[in-house]
Amino acid sequence: LSLEGSRTLTVCPGSVQPLSSQTLRASSSAGTDPQLLLYRVVRGPQLGRLFHAQQDSTGEALVNFTQAEVYAGNILYEHEMPTEPFWEAHDTLELQLSSPPARDVAATLAVAVSFEAACPQRPSHLWKNKGLWVPEGQRAKITMAALDASNLLASVPSPQRLEHDVLFQVTQFPSRGQLLVSEEPLHAGQPHFLQSQLAAGQLVYAHGGGGTQQDGFHFRAHLQGPAGATVAGPQTSEAFAITVRDVNERPPQPQASVPLRITRGSRAPISRAQLSVVDPDSAPGEIEYEVQRAPHNGFLSLVGGGPGPVTHFTQADVDSGRLAFVANGSSVAGVFQLSMSDGASPPLPMSLAVDILPSAIEVQLQAPLEVPQALGRSSLSQQQLRVVSDREEPEAAYRLIQGPKYGHLLVGGRPASAFSQLQIDQGEVVFAFTNFSSSHDHFRVLALARGVNASAVVNITVRALLHVWAGGPWPQGATLRLDPTILDAGELANRTGSVPHFRLLEGPRHGRVVRVPRARTEPGGSQLVEQFTQQDLEDGRLGLEVGRPEGRAPSPTGDSLTLELWAQGVPPAVASLDFATEPYNAARPYSVALLSVPEATRMEAGKPESSTPTGEPGPMASSPVPAVAKGGFLGFLEANMFS
């Protein structure tokens, strides 16, 4: 891996600057895709922050980014203005570049924040140069809130700062009024004032009357050393604007603003709902707006103007529908900080909020809602309902558009057809069965997030309270006893105070469930069973005839039983008993009670006359260890010879 580029970034104070390929450019000898060249921020900036243009600019600090994102101009450094003035400040970012299998490369990015740089975002090089508003024929103080060169002083090391000042030399005087310092007028012979005089409130502008035309003065500001000596250091030449206001002027009144809602990457007109003022003195064309700070999610443009952003527009532009917001790819909400003026009153701050709507949202359903059988209810979670768009939507709201058929949704214990993502996340939204005739249910919701909706179906299944055997393979051709070691709903019986019932829904593919006669006196052989109870299991009355797969040589195979389990006061549940079978092996100890073994095996043992045991299973029934497990086929013979 190699790292090129200047590794220096120059940023205007209080502004946002993208990292570029001139600043930071990584490459690899293998020609790696820029998407795979990953930077990790080891130490973030101290004077600002690093963020991604298309992610939440108010969220957590950026931790990782790729070279591809640098190329796209999506990695931004934002300088945060400090409270104390400065002339130049330095920041650093420590990064680690990685792209396995290459070795990581450490890099430092130096950031210079300087008033020296030419900044389109702020035309003045001074800490403040905001201009002045004065009523016609009157006078007003020019304070440090309007004009402040403290940042020039900040370029001097602090021990010597007290001995320095800033000298403002007026190069062009006001044409419609006078500048006074300590009540003495400035003129060609005395064209100077100092930062210290400005700080002491000694600088005044007095308007001469006779109209409300604009006024102002031009100046050059530079450092002055001890005893008035000129010293080398930062300097600037600028103009200070003075606006004269009609004394009868009524200032414009901003009206309440509705946020603009727009899908990302699209364009929408700004209307009076977003920007309007009440001003009886001014025509819409006289009410001017200036963008002081723009968000990162798009820009304002004028129809018929250039393609780029506009920073000045009028109420007439808004009223005629000429002003539009153009959203970029960002999904983040943002705010325009504007100043509005009718040209005769001091500017008023206004804001225009822009909410970026997702072009679409999706309800993520990661799993059906599983309801424990004995409980009959379960809380919804993000596993069942979560809305995502271009970001997660924690503010999502849900409305039932089709309720469940066998139960209801409750919020805080009462039936509810509407709820929020927050209520889901806090476990307050519960589905409860009210009709215990189905093992599954579903409901349909409409999700609403940031003005966009989507529907989804949540499936509900009941998880059987059933302990199912999970041992080794069972012998093909044998009949094994189906008892609580294999299927046990005893806990469900205890929880419901009822005898659970089983209904055979499907399987086994090779074999059948049979009722085993209790004694020789009972008529007939084994009866096919489709329903049975927990009591039948406990009584040892059931057998599973394990068949052989047809049409092929005996070999191990898998099989299953699908059952529906019912009990009083709870929903039914579907469960399956999955088992493996293999050709009977007389030498193998099977871990289940066998009621009979395959015919061929009996022939070999000299018992051709007995095909199915019809009497009591003998010691097997009460033996804690299945007889076959005691010693293979000989154990089976020993246990069954008297039957």
């Epitope: 309720g403 214990g413 039936p415 057809s417 009210t434």
Partner: antibody
Framework: QVQLQESGPGLVKPSQTLSLTCTVS?????????WNWIRQHPGKGLEWIGY???????NYNPSLKSRVTISRDTSKNQFSLKLSSVTAADTAVYYC?????WGQGTLVTVSS | DIQMTQSPSSLSASVGDRVTITCRAS??????LNWYQQKPGKAPKLLIY???SLHSGVPSRFSGSGSGTDFTLTISSLQPEDFATYYC?????????FGQGTKVEIK
């Protein structure tokens, strides 16, 4: 808050169909979950008849199921009860309710 | 159907008394139980839902507790306006069913 108001004839002849309507104000019948009909025989306890839900599905008390129909008219924000083949045993005060709030009830007498 | 049995069927009490009414379900209904108050000639009013949650506007002297099959409505200090008939109702399993009522009379 939601308010409910029952309306319908107070006297119904035996074997005929009892019809009542509940008008909901202060809320929509497509947002509240259950819209129930409940009755109370004179001097007796409460008996749930059935409900219609926000999405129009129904459930009825098995003891009355064969004779009951509950329907709704979302445009009028109303839901209705029809009980067919009535007898004197159906004489009762009939309430509509969403359980949180109840109508004031209307007495229906079944008599020829 | 789930049977709801209230006890006592009626009770006499004085203003300021602590009154307890019980409701028993024929099988478990979790916490899905409402309590209502009904005065003569009036519709029932919901007091408590979900066993112990107080409905809006209901005085805090009313409280509910229980789970499964046994539930209790308690009036901590009986007021003159509390003389009425009280019903419990389960909403755990269809059909919804009510208790037969407990009449609270002035002693």
């Amino acid at each position: 808050q939601v308010q409910l108001q029952e309306s319908g004839p107070g006297l119904v002849k035996p074997s005929q169909t009892l019809s009542l309507t509940c008008t909901v104000s202060g809320g929509s019948i497509t947002s509240g979950y259950y819209w129930n009909w409940i009755r109370q025989h004179p001097g007796k306890g409460l008996e749930w008849i059935g409900y219609i839900t926000f999405d129009g599905s129904n459930n009825y008390n098995p003891s009355l199921k064969s004779r009951v129909t509950i329907s709704r008219d979302t445009s009028k924000n109303q839901f209705s009860l029809k009980l067919s083949s009535v007898t004197a045993a159906d004489t009762a005060v009939y309430y509509c309710a969403d359980f949180d709030y109840w109508g004031q009830g209307t007495l229906v007498t079944v008599s020829s | 159907d789930i049977q709801m049995t209230q006890s006592p069927s009626s009770l006499s009490a004085s203003v300021g008394d602590r009154v307890t009414i019980t409701c028993r379900a024929s099988r478990g209904i979790r916490e899905y139980l409402n309590w209502y108050q009904q005065k003569p000639g009036k519709a029932p009013k919901l007091l408590i839902y979900y066993t112990g949650s107080l409905h809006s506007g209901v005085p805090s002297r009313f409280s509910g507790s229980g789970s499964g099959t046994d539930f209790t409505l308690t009036i901590s200090s009986l007021q003159p306006e509390d003389f009425a008939t009280y019903y419990c109702q389960q909403y755990s399993e269809l059909p919804w069913t009510f208790g037969q009522g407990t009449k609270v009379e002035i002693k």
